[in-house]
Every structure is written in C-alpha cells, then in structure tokens.
C-alpha cells in the first residue's frame, strides 16, 4: 500500500485539469505541485472542485507563499478567495484595480464580508487615497461603501473623487460623514453654474453650514423636503422663515406634513408665531 504522503504512480499532475476532481484530498496534496498550481490558477475556477479539495489547494499555496501570495496569483484566485481569512489577506499587497475587481466579482450579490472589507482596506491603504477609479469600482459593487467608512477614513478622499459619487451612495451616511464629504463636494463642484451646482451638491447638503444654506436660498433652487429633512439641525435653526420659504420655493407647503419631525420641528419651535403665520400653513410654534 502506498504511503499517503507519496503520490501514487502515474498520478503526478502535469497540469491543472478536470481529472483532478477525482483525486482524494491526500492525493491532491501529494500529486499537485504548488508551483504548477500557482502558474495555472486561472484554470481552477473552471473545475468543479469540492470545498474540501479547495482547502487542500489553499494549503499548498500557503506553503509556497508563507509571506503572502503574489498579485499574479491573487488576481486568478476566483472562488478560492472565499476560502481566505482576513489574516491571509492582510499579508497581500494588491495594487491593481483589475485584481480588486476580479475578487469583488466573486463576492458579487452578497453583503460585504470581513474578507472583502480587509481586501478593500489593504488596497486603499496601498494606494494612499481613495481615487476616483477605485471609488467608482467600490460603489458599483457596494453602493453603501462610502458610508461604511469612518469620518477619519473619508478625510483621505480627494475632492476629485467626489465626481464618482451617486446620490444613492450617500443614503446610509450619518451627519458626521456628511460633515467630512460636503466641503470636498463644494470644492469639486465649485466651477459649475447655479442650477447644475445644486443638482450635484444636493445629496451632500446634510453637511452644509448655515451660511451655505442662506446663500442657496438666494438662488431659487427649490429644495425638496426630502433634502431639507436631511440638513443639519444646527444649520437649519438660524434660518429665518423668509429664508426657508425661498430655499424650498413651491415645496414650502411640505413643511406642514413634516411639522412633527426633526429638523422641521426644531426649527418651527424657535420661530416667532407671526413669522410662521406668513406661510399660511397653520404651523404652530
């Protein structure tokens, strides 16, 4: 009987192909050369290996690259990526956006796993900042990605990257995150004309200070109530009734439906009743 550590005669793998699915785990371990596996990683995904067999292949790569896999291997990991732990991924140096896309594709349709989060973190740190192409890629796979970053992490986003941000990418951002993103957006869109500027800046206005809201009120922007409801309370409170009326334009009537909700309630409470009455909406301070 052949020892389990020795490859049976005639079973030594010459290439990574479908015949390997019939190998027992110990045979894969004994008969597949790690260097061969590394050079033919792109073939692994076309072969229906079991999870147990994939564990063996991962083990072989781990032995070959104890300090972490090279990017040439990482790019072709495919479903083997799902076998990686965050600790494995922390050893990697991923610099190619194509590699990142290939691995994100494997996890597509699922929530962001700890493995993916670690991969993205390694990639972004390696680049030094969250550039536009990276942000484009990440938000395409994970629309909530931007809002998963801490305010400190968001501070490394250059204003030029803001062009890649879509309104839905900001849906789950909290006020502290918008406080960081708004000044970057203001800078990014500063050369646009009034109406175009408002369309772009609108989804970032949850971080806008009072002075900017006052300025917008002079530009006939007709802010919708959904945007107004996301404004910072401290930015809304100093606005006069006349300024809010100008800011909202025809949408001012929507205040009535939101009078019990913040920040509308906070604002109403601090206005003179005579001023509120000029709106003709029956708002009670």
């Amino acid at each position: 009987e052949v020892e389990k550590t020795a490859c049976p005669s005639g079973k030594k793998a010459r290439e990574i192909d479908e015949s390997l699915i019939f190998y027992k785990k110990w045979e894969l371990e004994a008969c597949v050369d790690a260097a061969l596996l590394a050079t033919q990683m792109d073939r692994v995904n076309a072969i229906p290996f079991t999870y147990e067999q994939l564990d063996v292949l991962k083990h072989k790569l781990d032995e070959l690259y104890p300090q972490g896999y090279p990017e040439s291997v990482i790019q072709h990991l495919g479903y083997l990526f799902l076998k990686m732990s965050p600790e494995d991924i922390r050893k990697w140096n991923v610099t190619s956006l194509e590699t990142l896309k290939a691995l994100l594709e494997v996890n597509k349709g699922h929530e962001m796993s700890p493995q993916v989060a670690t991969l993205i973190d390694r990639f972004v740190k390696g680049r030094g900042q969250l550039d536009k192409d990276t942000l484009d890629t990440l938000t395409a796979f994970y629309p909530g990605y931007l809002c998963s970053l801490s305010p400190e992490e968001l501070s490394s986003v250059p204003p030029s990257s803001i062009w890649a941000v879509r309104p839905q990418d900001l849906d789950t951002c909290d006020p502290r995150q918008l406080d960081v993103l708004y000044p970057k957006a203001r800078l990014a869109f500063q050369n646009m004309n009034g109406s175009e500027y408002f369309v772009k800046i609108q989804s970032f206005l949850g971080g806008a200070p009072t002075e900017d809201l006052k300025a917008l009120s002079q530009q006939n922007v007709s802010m919708d109530l959904a945007t107004f409801m996301k404004l910072r309370t401290d930015a809304v409170l100093p606005l006069t009734v006349a300024e809010v009326q100008k800011l909202l334009g025809p949408h001012v009537e929507g205040l009535k439906a939101e009078e019990r909700h913040r920040p509308v309630r906070d604002w109403i409470l601090r206005q003179r009743q005579d001023d509120l009455d000029t709106l003709g909406l029956g708002l009670q301070g």
């Epitope: 909290d174 502290r176 409801m229 309370t233 409470l269 301070g285």
Partner: antibody, heavy 119, light 107 residues
Framework: QVQLQESGPGLVKPSETLSLTCTVS??????????WSWIRQPPGKGLEWIGY???????NYNPSLKSRVTISVDTSKNQFSLKLSSVTAADTAVYYC???????????WGQGTMVTVSS | DIQMTQSPSSLSASVGDRVTITCRAS??????LNWYQQKPGKAPKLLIY???SLQSGVPSRFSGSGSGTDFTLTISSLQPEDFATYYC?????????FGGGTKVEIK
C-alpha cells in the same frame, strides 16, 4: 454646570392630581437650544416619556397621556412643572425631569423622585 | 407613535467581551437615535447621540452605528462598571419613544 432637582409629594391618592416641580440651577430654563422634559419609570419597568416644554411655553405630550397632562414653565423661578390628573395605581413610578438638548438628547437628568399612588 | 424594539432584552457576558445591542424603529428615524445607560436606583446617562456621536466623558469603548430603522450599540470590551440596562430612544418624531431596554448581566 447645569443641575436639575425634582420636588413634590411622594404619595398621591387615586383620582387626584400629581404635581411635581423641577428646579434648574447652573443654567437657564430660557436656553435657546433646550427643551425641558418629564420622563417616568414604573418599578421594574422601562422609561416612558411624558412630555416637554420650551421656554416660550410651547408644549408637546405623549399621546397616551395627553388628556391628563399639563407641563408649564416659570422663567422667573427657573422652574418647570408637571401636573398629571386623575391618577391611578398605574401612575406609580419614579418621575425624572431632564434637559433635552437639540443636538444631543437627554443629556442632563434629575435624580428622580418616587411617586406612589395609593389611598 | 414610532415603536422602538430592542434586542436582546437581556444578555449575560464576561468582562472583556464584545457586546452588541440592536434597536429597530418601526419607521425611518434618520439618525435621530440616542443610547442611554441606567444602573439600579440611578437616573439614566446619555452615552451616544445622533446614532453614532459619543457624548462627552463617555469611554471610547462605547460606539453606535446605523441610520434609518436599524441601529447598534457596541461595547468593544466590557468592563465591570458596564453591567447595567441600556435603552435606545428616538427623537425624530415629536412623540419621543424608548426601547424596552437591554439588561447586561455578569456571566
């Protein structure tokens, strides 16, 4: 710094009116950014918000208690008060007054006063 | 009224454990959610406001996250003084409501 102190009878008879006062020290009840709330907690149970008042006199009450509650403010005494009418044993609780800061929430609380409704 | 549902209602944990408490609102409340800690016989204490902002003087092991309807309070490494009852509270709607509370007990 701002401190709150509840005062009032610890025992009230059923069907009578519960009256409590909260005295604000180290700050002003006329603060632009603050509302002043009453919150209660029956023994062994969770917290229930009763209502709030702004220094202007504007009030807002818990819908389930609205018909029985009156909250008032006396800016000259730096106090606000709670009146709860037609009390029953179900109103037995620790009653807290609290500052509701517009930016942070209930950031300052009184130490609470136990009110028992019993004949 | 907006209902606030906390889970679990109680949990047992050891010093050093990572503890997570969740709070769900019956409708969207944006980020208008606060977390409080209450110890027996004491008034509640504000820990987190606006869903994720740490109140002054509160240890950094406490953190909050979430927006819309789902929120989380996390204690990264439980300390002996953290055994208490925790409440979430929404201030989005004018009728403020609290969650039912989560009692954190010693295992």
């Amino acid at each position: 710094q701002v401190q709150l102190q509840e005062s009032g009878p610890g025992l009230v008879k059923p069907s009578e009116t519960l009256s409590l006062t909260c005295t604000v020290s180290g700050g002003s009840v006329s603060s632009y950014h603050d509302l002043w709330s009453w919150i209660r907690q029956p023994p062994g149970k969770g917290l229930e918000w009763i209502g709030y008042i702004y220094y202007s006199g504007s009030t807002n009450y818990n819908p389930s208690l609205k018909s029985r509650v009156t909250i008032s403010v006396d800016t000259s005494k730096n106090q606000f008060s709670l009146k709860l009418s037609s009390v029953t044993a179900a109103d037995t609780a620790v009653y807290y007054c609290a500052r509701d800061n517009v930016f942070t929430g209930f950031d300052i609380w009184g130490q609470g006063t136990m009110v028992t409704v019993s004949s | 009224d907006i209902q606030m549902t906390q889970s679990p209602s109680s949990l047992s944990a050891s010093v050093g454990d990572r503890v997570t408490i969740t709070c769900r609102a019956s409708q969207s409340i944006s980020s208008y959610l606060n977390w409080y800690q209450q110890k027996p016989g004491k008034a509640p204490k504000l820990l987190i406001y606006a869903a994720s902002s740490l109140q002054s003087g509160v240890p950094s092991r406490f953190s909050g996250s979430g927006s819309g309807t789902d929120f989380t309070l996390t204690i990264s490494s439980l300390q002996p003084e953290d055994f208490a009852t925790y409440y979430c509270q929404q201030s989005y709607d004018a009728s403020y409501t609290f969650g039912g509370g989560t009692k954190v007990e010693i295992k």
